[in-house]
């Protein structure tokens, strides 16, 4: 999906008002220095591409973050503010099925969510030059 035509300011508002709090809740009990940020992004569409990938694609050691509250809110924000996102990224019938129970939080998942926090912070500061 091409995130170029999203309403970035509206997505930023959703992040600041609610998604960020859920990410913090997920990471509670973890030191902020525990994980190094290894995933980066260069501009807002790129950041959303990376956020989408880390949030919804299963990885080794962290099978699914998609059922977490921050992920459902991310999906909702993208569905609302990115034209055509729902049609290309979400199966309508899937969206209406009952959710499965949450997976156990692993250290790998915590590391992945820590990367997500970094990507979101970068998304919110698009004018900063890449380190």
């Amino acid at each position: 999906y091409d995130f170029t035509n999203c309403d970035f300011e509206k997505i930023k508002a959703a992040y600041l008002s609610t998604i960020s709090k859920d990410l913090i809740t997920y990471m509670s009990g973890t030191k902020s220095t525990e994980f190094n940020n290894t995933v980066s992004c260069s501009n807002r569409p790129h950041c959303l591409t990376e956020i989408q990938s880390l949030t919804f694609n299963p990885t080794a050691g962290c099978a699914s973050l998609a059922k977490e509250m921050f992920a459902m809110k991310t999906k909702a924000a993208l569905a609302i503010w990115c034209p055509g996102y729902s049609e290309t990224q979400i199966n309508a019938t899937q969206a209406m099925k009952k959710r499965r129970k949450r997976k156990v939080t692993t250290n790998k998942c915590l590391e992945q969510v820590s990367q997500l926090q970094g990507l979101w912070r970068r998304f919110n500061r698009p004018l900063l030059k890449q380190q």
Partner: antibody, heavy 120, light 111 residues
């Protein structure tokens, strides 16, 4: 069962405000969109706006911007639509309608409607 | 935004097919695959019949079908039955985050 139940009919004076409620049951309220649509007597359907409680997003139709306020109370699974500065042309049946999860623009469940009459 | 354009009336005999058109612009119907159709009987709330241009919710008979070409969407009711007599409204997502831009409605009469 899965339903939206709206508050009863209202009679209002021009210039006043009306607040209509819409109580959801049988589904996860926060995950869906709650849209408000009205229908004047003998006329077509007109969209007023939507709230997606999960992310606290509200969007209003340009025509009603500044005059309509949509809110939601997730603890009671209830959405509200308040319309201010009422005029006779606002006399209509007001419906709340559920927008599908992540596809908030498809209204797959409707309330029974609330008749709002604006008359002096 | 202006309302989508629908013919005020349409009719057909039982067993026949009827197609109702809904014309918009590239900012609504033409720009998004987010067209839906609603059936409304007198004194009742509308009911979703078609969404996503051509998808049918469960419980809606397969006699109802939807399509889109350019800026025009269409609803076809085949094998008309008496209970199909109702008002039909098209709706489209429109630019500027309008979730429901409706047509003026078409009164379908089963002769």
């Amino acid at each position: 069962q899965v339903q939206l139940v709206q508050s009863g009919a209202e009679v209002k004076k021009p210039g006043s405000s009306v607040k209509v409620s819409c109580k959801a049951s049988g589904f996860t309220f926060g995950s869906y969109g709650i849209n408000w649509v009205r229908q004047a007597p003998g006329q077509g359907l007109e969209w007023l706006g939507v709230i997606v409680p999960l992310v606290g997003v509200t969007i209003y139709a340009e025509k009603f911007q500044g005059r309509v306020t949509i809110t939601a109370d997730t603890s009671t699974s209830t959405a509200y639509m308040e319309l201010s500065s009422l005029r006779s042309e606002d006399t209509a049946v007001y419906y709340c309608a559920r927008g599908q999860e992540y596809f908030y623009w498809y209204f797959d469940l409707w309330g029974q409607g609330t008749l709002v009459t604006v008359s002096s | 935004q202006s309302a989508l354009t629908q013919p005020p009336s349409a009719s057909g005999s039982p067993g026949q097919s009827v197609t109702i058109s809904c014309t918009g612009t590239s900012s609504d119907i033409g720009g998004y695959d987010r067209v839906s159709w609603y059936q409304q009987h007198p004194g009742k709330a509308p009911k979703l019949m078609i969404y996503g241009v051509s998808k049918r919710p469960s419980g809606v008979p397969d006699r109802f079908s939807g399509s889109k070409s350019g800026n025009t969407a269409s609803l076809t009711v085949s094998g008309l039955q008496a209970e199909d007599e109702a008002d039909y409204y098209c709706s489209s997502y429109a630019s500027g985050h309008t979730f429901g831009l409706f047509g003026g409605g078409t009164k379908l009469t089963v002769l």
